[in-house]
Amino acid sequence: APVRSLNCTLRDSQQKSLVMSGPYELKALHLQGQDMEQQVVFSMSFVQGEESNDKIPVALGLKEKNLYLSCVLKDDKPTLQLESVDPKNYPKKKMEKRFVFNKIEINNKLEFESAQFPNWYISTSQAENMPVFLGGTKGGQDITDFTMQFVSS
């Protein structure tokens, strides 16, 4: 059976939207009005992995682009990157470990924990216009909570 996917946008808990910053980076900033069209639309795929009521394994692709968020070690540090893939082969049910995030729902907010690096989360900075990154702390200065907005196909 083909992998189930949905289209969505994400905003952090400060209502910052995610936009492309160069070919392989996302940044978070406040958008209004027509500028909202700049925000990236994700194709969130529901993939194979350990699942529970509040934790669902997903992959986050950029809609109609052959790019996925992935987590790898760079200079011995877990790092978030946008990785290009062969569109003939993705998305798929059995994604490589680096592409998998545990979507965790807590109090109507979402966290995205790296399956490859437990306790590391997709994060944004308090500051405007800064890169989206993989952070190893929750509840500190950096933001790890998001809301999801469904986008019609």
């Epitope: 992995g49 790898v72 990785e83 290009s84 082969n89 470990k97 490859q116």
Partner: antibody, heavy 120, light 107 residues
């Protein structure tokens, strides 16, 4: 010092089954980010990736083998297994246990290998 | 699956020679490539990972380069201990696949 010691190889008839073991020491199979798997090498041939399991139990298989081979592990014994069913002559190979950390993989440590011969 | 093709399949060289082995992928594999050395009756040994990073304890005469779909392993000055078979491995996409190997022999 990391050590991987395979056992369980031997002569088996076509259609038969065999379970290989890989006893690991010097590290824990359940350490976050840890991966271990099996790579085989038919006599006089190249290397072929067989199967892999991550610290959290996430398994991957070579699609050509998945229906017949099952990877598992026992964390209490720090041991990796490969259950091989419906064996064929072309499964004759040295089977190596190999360790990596994180994806994408590179195999840092290898066992000495155990020979599986499928013949009547 | 991604097919990895090594060239040449066999290579004859002398001590002191500079040797280059090529590995081509059937599609872009980023820099997710590692190289292994294997001697007869022994397990493979990791030489290089992430295309160009030298594994600890590996002599500096070994180096790796490339990106996308074409990669090279270079031995700058061949030593007697280097006669062996060399394999590349792609880790971009499951199933992980090896090249068919390059056997390095004494000329």
């Amino acid at each position: 010092e990391v050590q991987l010691v395979e056992s369980g190889g031997g002569l088996v008839q076509p259609g038969g089954s065999l379970r290989l073991s890989c006893a690991a020491s010097g590290f824990s199979l359940s350490t976050s980010g840890m991966g271990v798997g099996w790579v085989r090498q038919a006599p006089g041939k190249g290397l072929e990736w067989v199967s892999h399991i991550w610290w959290d139990g996430d398994e991957s298989y070579n699609p050509s083998l998945k229906s017949r081979f099952t990877i598992s592990r026992d964390n209490s014994k720090n041991t990796l297994y490969l259950q091989m069913n419906s064996l064929r002559a072309e499964d004759t190979a040295v089977y190596y246990c190999a360790k990596n950390r994180y994806d994408p993989p590179w195999f840092v440590d290898w066992g000495q290998g155990t020979l599986v011969t499928v013949s009547s | 699956e991604i097919v990895m093709t090594q060239s040449p399949s066999t290579l004859s060289a002398s001590v002191g020679d500079r040797v280059i082995i090529t590995c081509r992928a059937s599609q872009d594999i980023s820099n997710y490539l590692s190289w292994y050395q294997q001697k007869p009756g022994k397990a493979p040994k990791l030489l290089i990972y992430y295309t160009s990073k030298l594994h600890s304890g590996v002599p500096s005469r070994f180096s790796g380069s490339g990106s996308g779909a074409e990669f090279t392993l270079t031995i700058s000055s061949l030593q007697p201990d280097d006669f062996a078979t060399y394999y590349c491995l792609q880790g971009k996409m499951l199933p992980w696949t090896f090249g068919q190997g390059t056997k390095l022999t004494v000329k």
